[in-house]
Amino acid sequence: SIPWNLERITPPRYRADEYQPPDGGSLVEVYLLDTSIQSDHREIEGRVMVTDFENVPEEDGTRFHRQASKCDSHGTHLAGVVSGRDAGVAKGASMRSLRVLNCQGKGTVSGTLIGLEFIRKSQLVQPVGPLVVLLPLAGGYSRVLNAACQRLARAGVVLVTAAGNFRDDACLYSPASAPEVITVGATNAQDQPVTLGTLGTNFGRCVDLFAPGEDIIGASSDCSTCFVSQSGTSQAAAHVAGIAAMMLSAEPELTLAELRQRLIHFSAKDVINEAWFPEDQRVLTPNLVAALPPSTHENLYFQ
Amino acid sequence: GAMGQEDEDGDYEELVLALRSEEDGLAEAPEHGTTATFHRCAKDPWRLPGTYVVVLKEETHLSQSERTARRLQAQAARRGYLTKILHVFHGLLPGFLVKMSGDLLELALKLPHVDYIEEDSSVFAQ
């Protein structure tokens, strides 16, 4: 049966035993800046092109044992959430992966900047259709990372990022705090903000909307046909990247402002229990859970 | 995220160092009164001192970025410091990534075309 997260983002008129839109997002390229990925996993084979871009710091600790499946875990899962064959949002979207996070899931602002620059140069060399950039990472507030995101957004690229898993104001983190970026918080099957250990999803006025981000079934790098459940604002951001890819595939001329407006318009309103957020943040945090549009044109969003 | 907000740095640290244009006899010294700023991550464990992104003013060309980077290396060498240019940015932001001692920040902030300098920091999978 359909996983809860795919059911949650699907408009009622499309609900069935299966998540039906089979080829959504086919005109869009989604760039993923994350860990390495298992590119031949059954969920994503042929859907993800691994670029030769790699800029990662060395792993911490002298006794760190580099295990391939662990190195690929985060990125493989997210690629599956965006475009996976069985459990993906935008099954028709093609992806390109850049490695900016090491085997411990750690990267640098500088490495991320060089990755964003790589995307811009690729766009200039070979202009394609609409581009979505997924940044499932967060660091402290960074003026330079926010500036780079702003420049890329002004070049017509849609950037989607994780709000962060620190149960804190997203405005204190980057790229979550960049105004031009679509910043995504995480909710669970009960439409509650996601708790992650002692922490949880970030919140506040720098968050644009929320999306499913707890117990998300997706590709596991443990084996080529394995699935695993993962949680976090990265998973939430991957849902929105998939939804954005489908919207842009249906309407390639959408501006960032129009896309943002559509994402907000089609979101479920006032379903999140705001009591989870600190009192001073409740009014600032958007009570929106992302969803696909109930297309007025048959198959508009599912071509 | 969330368009329409003013930039809020939170508890983000900012060090403003006034430029003394006469120092080092810079041929392309900035206009009087402009200041380049230094930024670093407010979360101490995430800081990566020793690597800095030098961001140049918006209209700076690649050749000027390269020249500024070389100038920094030359001036640092005269003071007995080794530096390494790790990457020259162009396409999104003009600037360069440099591995150097924090002792050279004051010198770097006085270079022509410099808008601000940010110490590198960590980002994490979410």
Epitope: E18, D23, D40, E45, G46, V48 | -
Partner: antibody, heavy 115, light 116 residues
Framework: QVQLVQSGAEVKKPGASVKVSCKAS????????ISWVRQAPGQGLEWMGW????????NYAQKVQGRVTMTTDTSTSTAYMELRSLRSDDTAVYYC????????WGQGTLVTVSS | QPVLTQPLFASASLGASVTLTCTLS???????VDWYQQRPGKGPRFVMR????????SKGEGIPDRFSVLGSGLNRYLTIKNIQEEDESDYHC?????????????FGGGTKLTVL
């Protein structure tokens, strides 16, 4: 264009081993694993297993588990399938196919097991 | 795991249409099925993938527009319109099942299509 080119026909005695190669071209080798499928004379298709070109992980069909070894050489974009302890009912045409999608196939390698 | 059942033989006149059927065993109505064409003495060729919503993804390379698919309940159909002599082939269907160590690929027995 995408091509999978397999090694030539083999005649083997029962108990021997055979190693079939499959050289891929026209796509990024590590973006798709390699599936192996065989077809006995006049019969349908039988899946034998799959190998990851990315990390070498394998997934074998129960029927051949223990007798089959699949390997890859990414430097030459070549996949290999070795079948040991051959029996007469292993006589078949052996095919490699691209990934789980199996959207491109090799021309086949006839392996005859006969005493 | 699912069992895929195909009729052994089918025939159609030149220029006519024919629909080949692949039936999944009970309980597997949501499964995707791949269709393959195998001309005499040649290797299989991917035609297209089908589920209850119709085609999944795109057709195999060089597959003409005369080939189309449909899915309904446990049945997966491959229809060939305006049949040509080169369509005379064996047609196999296949499906993936399970995950991890339980993953298998199953194939139907194949249908031999004769062009009259």
């Amino acid at each position: 264009q995408v091509q999978l080119v397999q090694s030539g026909a083999e005649v083997k005695k029962p108990g021997a081993s055979v190693k079939v190669s499959c050289k891929a071209s026209g796509y990024t080798f590590t973006s798709y694993g390699i599936s192996w499928v065989r077809q006995a004379p006049g019969q349908g298709l039988e899946w034998m297993g799959w190998i990851s070109t990315y990390n070498g992980n394998t997934n074998y069909a129960q029927k051949v588990q223990g007798r089959v070894t699949m390997t890859t050489d990414t430097s030459t974009s070549t996949a290999y399938m070795e079948l040991r302890s051959l029996r007469s009912d292993d006589t078949a045409v052996y095919y490699c196919a691209r990934g789980y999608t199996r959207d491109y196939w090799g021309q086949g390698t006839l392996v005859t097991v006969s005493s | 795991q699912p069992v895929l059942t195909q009729p052994l033989f089918a025939s159609a006149s030149l220029g006519a249409s024919v629909t080949l059927t692949c039936t999944l065993s009970s309980g597997y109505s949501s499964y995707e099925v791949d269709w393959y064409q195998q001309r005499p003495g040649k290797g299989p060729r991917f035609v297209m993938r089908v589920d209850t919503g119709g085609i999944v993804g795109s057709k195999g390379e060089g597959i003409p527009d005369r080939f189309s698919v449909l899915g309904s309940g446990l049945n997966r159909y491959l229809t060939i319109k305006n049949i040509q002599e080169e369509d005379e082939s064996d047609y196999h269907c296949g499906a993936d099942h399970g995950s991890g160590t339980n993953f298998v690929v199953v194939f139907g027995g194949g249908t031999k299509l004769t062009v009259l």
